[in-house]
């Protein structure tokens, strides 16, 4: 292990579409992958008229977009489906939205997930 890196071994798991996908609805997911590759957690959600609806949470394969991110933060401006990834066990329990705007200051929209 590289000093200072949070190794991801498990992530919070949630699937709003669990019946169609034939998975569990919620739980803890152990993360698998090639032994030399990094592993991450992710969260995806929608903002329906100001109401946060979680789509999925789980493990994410080696991705340089996620390196050294201890917090799960979406930075894209108003995506159709919000996505964030992070490193560290269960780092996807909390996720937030900090859009990167060119002119105005970024606004913080922290999200506390409440799976149904």
């Amino acid at each position: 292990a590289i000093l200072g890196r949070s190794e991801t071994q498990e992530c919070l798991f949630f699937n709003a579409n669990w019946e169609k996908d034939r998975t569990n609805q919620t739980g803890v997911e152990p993360c698998y992958g090639d032994k030399d590759k990094r592993r991450h957690c992710f969260a995806t959600w929608k903002n329906i008229s100001g109401s946060i609806e979680i789509v999925k949470q789980g493990c994410w394969l080696d991705d340089i977009n996620c390196y050294d991110r201890t917090d799960c933060v979406e930075k894209k401006d108003s995506p159709e489906v919000y996505f964030c990834c992070c490193e560290g066990n269960m780092c996807n329990e909390k996720f937030s939205y900090f859009p990167e705007m060119e002119v105005t200051q970024p606004t913080s929209n922290p999200v506390t997930p409440k799976p149904p």
Partner: antibody, heavy 115, light 111 residues
Framework: QVQLVQSGAEVKKPGASVKVSCKAS????????INWVRQAPGQGLEWMGT????????SYAQKFQGRVTMTRDTSISTAYMELSRLRSDDTAVYYC????????WGQGTLVTVSS | QSALTQPASVSGSPGQSITISCTGT?????????VNWYQQHPGKAPKLMIY???KRQSGVSNRFSGSKSGNTASLTISGLQAEDEADYYC???????????FGGGTKLTVL
């Protein structure tokens, strides 16, 4: 073991569209990206675009903007690449590959565009 | 993003070492550790050999190694064997904020 199995060869007329599928198994489909790459006969690899398999968000190479559409169906662990307004120079083998590092590849789908 | 530059061909005798270069710019190859190397035999799909400049993909022989200096990434194959004869492509990570690009490919001939 990780496998990406693509749909069979297609012959299309100029102006038509083609939709190639890529069925993933051996890993959690919604845990990475699917990239699409093509290779014209005797030529090199050309990146077409990528889809985030969990969120569905896409990024396309500028050359294919407006002609390519990448989608996925998470319930059957399958990604799709549709290319429209086909021309003869779209004749190529089309590959899907897993993840940002392209660590596993499909077997390829030959698309022939000919009048 | 413009294509990465590779030599069209290289050759070597069995047992020798060869190096294939992949040149980009200071804003891609030079500033990010995201270059990969792929091997492709005729009629087959490409195979990932090296990712992240210098990390060997699982199951790949340690005769294959990757490095980077400035804006140029390199693939070195030591102890050349007949089965190494193939086309080799460099390429970049693609996904999220990153767009993919490949080099033009290098044909390796084992003499």
């Amino acid at each position: 073991q990780v496998q990406l199995v693509q749909s069979g060869a297609e012959v299309k007329k100029p102006g038509a569209s083609v939709k190639v599928s890529c069925k993933a198994s051996g890993y959690t489909f919604t845990s990475s990206y699917i990239n699409w790459v093509r290779q014209a006969p005797g030529q090199g690899l050309e990146w077409m675009g990528t889809i985030n398999a969990v969120s569905g968000s896409t990024s396309y190479a500028q050359k294919f903007q407006g002609r390519v559409t990448m989608t996925r169906d998470t319930s059957i662990s399958t990604a799709y690449m549709e290319l429209s307004r086909l021309r003869s120079d779209d004749t190529a083998v089309y590959y899907c590959a897993r993840g940002g590092w392209f660590d596993y590849w499909g077997q390829g789908t030959l698309v022939t565009v000919s009048s | 993003q413009s294509a990465l530059t590779q030599p069209a061909s290289v050759s070597g005798s069995p047992g020798q070492s060869i190096t294939i270069s992949c040149t980009g710019t200071s804003s891609d190859v030079g500033s990010k550790n995201y270059v990969n190397w792929y091997q492709q035999h005729p009629g087959k799909a490409p195979k990932l050999m090296i990712y992240g400049v210098s990390k060997r993909q699982s199951g790949v022989s340690n005769r294959f190694s990757g490095s980077k200096s400035g804006n140029t990434a390199s693939l070195t194959i030591s102890g050349l064997q007949a089965e190494d004869e193939a086309d080799y492509y460099c390429g970049t990570f693609a996904g999220g904020d990153y767009y993919g690009v490949f080099g033009g490919g290098t044909k390796l001939t084992v003499l």
